[in-house]
């Protein structure tokens, strides 16, 4: 039994890391791997993490981490019974993939603007929490062509646009997903989307 | 409110022992990394021992090793550190404190401190 | 045992004044850096853990920054009671290490 990938691993910065390997044939992860994972600090405890099955060959550990900060390194060590097949480390504030907003939703009763909102998906304590900015992506469920993304550079999870930039009486579809330049994150996964039907009043013509 | 007491200092023979005590209340002592941090007459501060949550693994500076022993009651919600063949460079004030994470790192509580005299 | 250089040693100043305090590892440390502060008579008190985050309930004009090697400490604008003596302390190399403290006076 030999790794075929070696693991790489990102953190959410909260309290989960995921960790993904590919072994070179056939493995039922949870019975016969086990991946370790220890600060480098003093009397730091040692945890054990039972991998799941992601495709024939592929692993996938989900790692429970409290109150991750900038210094914390971890030594990974993947075992097969009592054989050691990998030894690594990881440095959480250098692989940093941000949680997904949640909660997105589209005011329609602001005069002719749109104002769309979400939760930032970390609490005020965490660090990530005052360093993230958003991009919303709004498109058509009836062109495809229709498809538009808003960089939101600001810290306030909000954007407001004028109904009369999209078209009137279509249905359209907004998702956010977030990331932090402070740790050069990856971006996060996209939240899950929110459906409304555009219809603003056009403005009287002048003749 | 958080607060650890530490008792049990004084003046001591040289060679002699002593035992320092630190209560901890209004937070949960059970979970909690502590650990003895001294500081000398000239100021300087010094990680003494440390110790894990249940007491199964502990740390000490190589200039106490053998002679100090960190231990704790949690039934009791204390924090216990018995020094012997004391030497007159252990003369300092000795804080009780809390590990801010589960491993030696920043200390976010501290005691007031308990002064010990180790003369000839 | 690594080695903790904080300098100056003492520090006059004024009120509203920036202070900035700085520490030297004598090898890599990463960001496992603490800054304490002790007020006369009294014990050390958390400000800063892993380099640059600002404990619970610490005022914003503290702030501290750095990695690897070199440290820094800032105050923006000092006030009163921010008489005392500042303490750096390294966890990343056994044993752990203090720097000899920065006493900041105010003229």
């Known amino acids: 039994m030999k790794v075929l990938q070696e693991p790489t691993c990102v953190s959410d910065y909260m309290s989960i890391s995921t960790c993904e390997w590919k072994m070179n044939g056939p493995t039922n992860c949870s019975t016969e791997l086990r991946l370790l994972y220890q600060l480098v600090f003093l009397l730091s405890e040692a945890h054990t993490c039972i991998p799941e099955n992601n495709g024939g060959a592929g692993c996938v550990c989900h790692l429970l981490m409290d109150d991750v900060v900038s210094a914390d390194n971890y030594t990974l060590d993947l075992w097969a019974g009592q054989q050691l097949l990998w030894k690594g480390s990881f440095k959480p504030s250098e692989h940093v993939k941000p949680r997904a907003p949640g909660n997105l939703t589209v005011h329609t009763n602001v005069s002719d603007t749109l104002l769309l909102t979400w939760s930032n998906p970390y609490p005020p304590d965490n660090y990530l929490y005052n360093h993230l900015t958003y991009a919303v992506n709004i498109w058509s469920e009836n062109d495809p062509a229709d498809f538009r993304i808003y960089n939101v550079t600001y810290l306030e999870p909000s954007l407001r646009i004028a109904a009369s930039t999209l078209k009137s009486g279509i249905s359209y579809r907004a998702r956010v997903r977030a990331w932090a330049q402070c740790y050069n994150t990856t971006w996060s996964e996209w939240s899950p989307s929110t459906k409304w039907h555009n219809s603003y009043r056009e403005p009287f013509e002048q003749h | 409110d958080v607060q650890l007491v530490e008792s049990g200092g004084g003046l001591v023979q040289l060679g002699g022992s002593l035992r320092l005590s630190c209560a901890a209340s209004?937070?949960?002592?059970?979970?909690?990394?502590m650990s003895w941090v001294r500081q000398t007459p000239e100021k300087r501060l010094e990680l003494v021992a440390a110790?894990?949550?249940?007491?199964?693994?502990?740390y000490y500076a190589d200039s106490v090793k053998g002679r100090f022993t960190i231990s704790r009651d949690n039934s009791k919600n204390t924090l216990y550190l018995q020094m012997s063949s004391l030497r007159a460079e252990d003369t300092a004030v000795y804080y009780c404190?809390?590990?801010?994470?589960?491993?030696?790192?920043?200390?976010?509580?501290w005691g007031q401190g308990t002064s010990v005299t180790v003369s000839s | 045992d690594i080695q903790m250089t904080q300098s100056p040693s003492s520090l006059s100043t004024s009120v509203g004044d920036r202070v900035t305090i700085t520490c030297k590892a004598s090898?890599?440390?990463?960001?496992?850096v603490v800054w304490y502060q002790q007020k006369p008579g009294k014990s050390p008190k958390l400000l800063i853990y892993?380099?640059?985050y600002r404990y619970t309930g610490v005022p914003s004009r503290f702030s501290g920054s750095g990695s690897g090697t070199d440290f820094t400490f800032t105050i923006s604008s000092v006030q009163p009671e921010d008489i005392a003596t500042y303490y750096c302390?390294?966890?990343?190399?056994?044993?752990?290490?203090f720097g000899g403290g920065t006493k900041l006076e105010i003229k």
């Open positions: 302390h390294q966890y990343y190399g056994s044993p752990p290490t």
């Open positions: 110790i894990n949550s249940n007491g199964g693994k502990t």
């Open positions: 090898q890599d440390v990463s960001t496992a």
């Open positions: 404190t809390r590990q801010r994470g589960n491993y030696v790192g920043a200390m976010d509580y």
């Open positions: 209004g937070f949960t002592f059970s979970s909690s990394y």
């Open positions: 892993s380099a640059s």
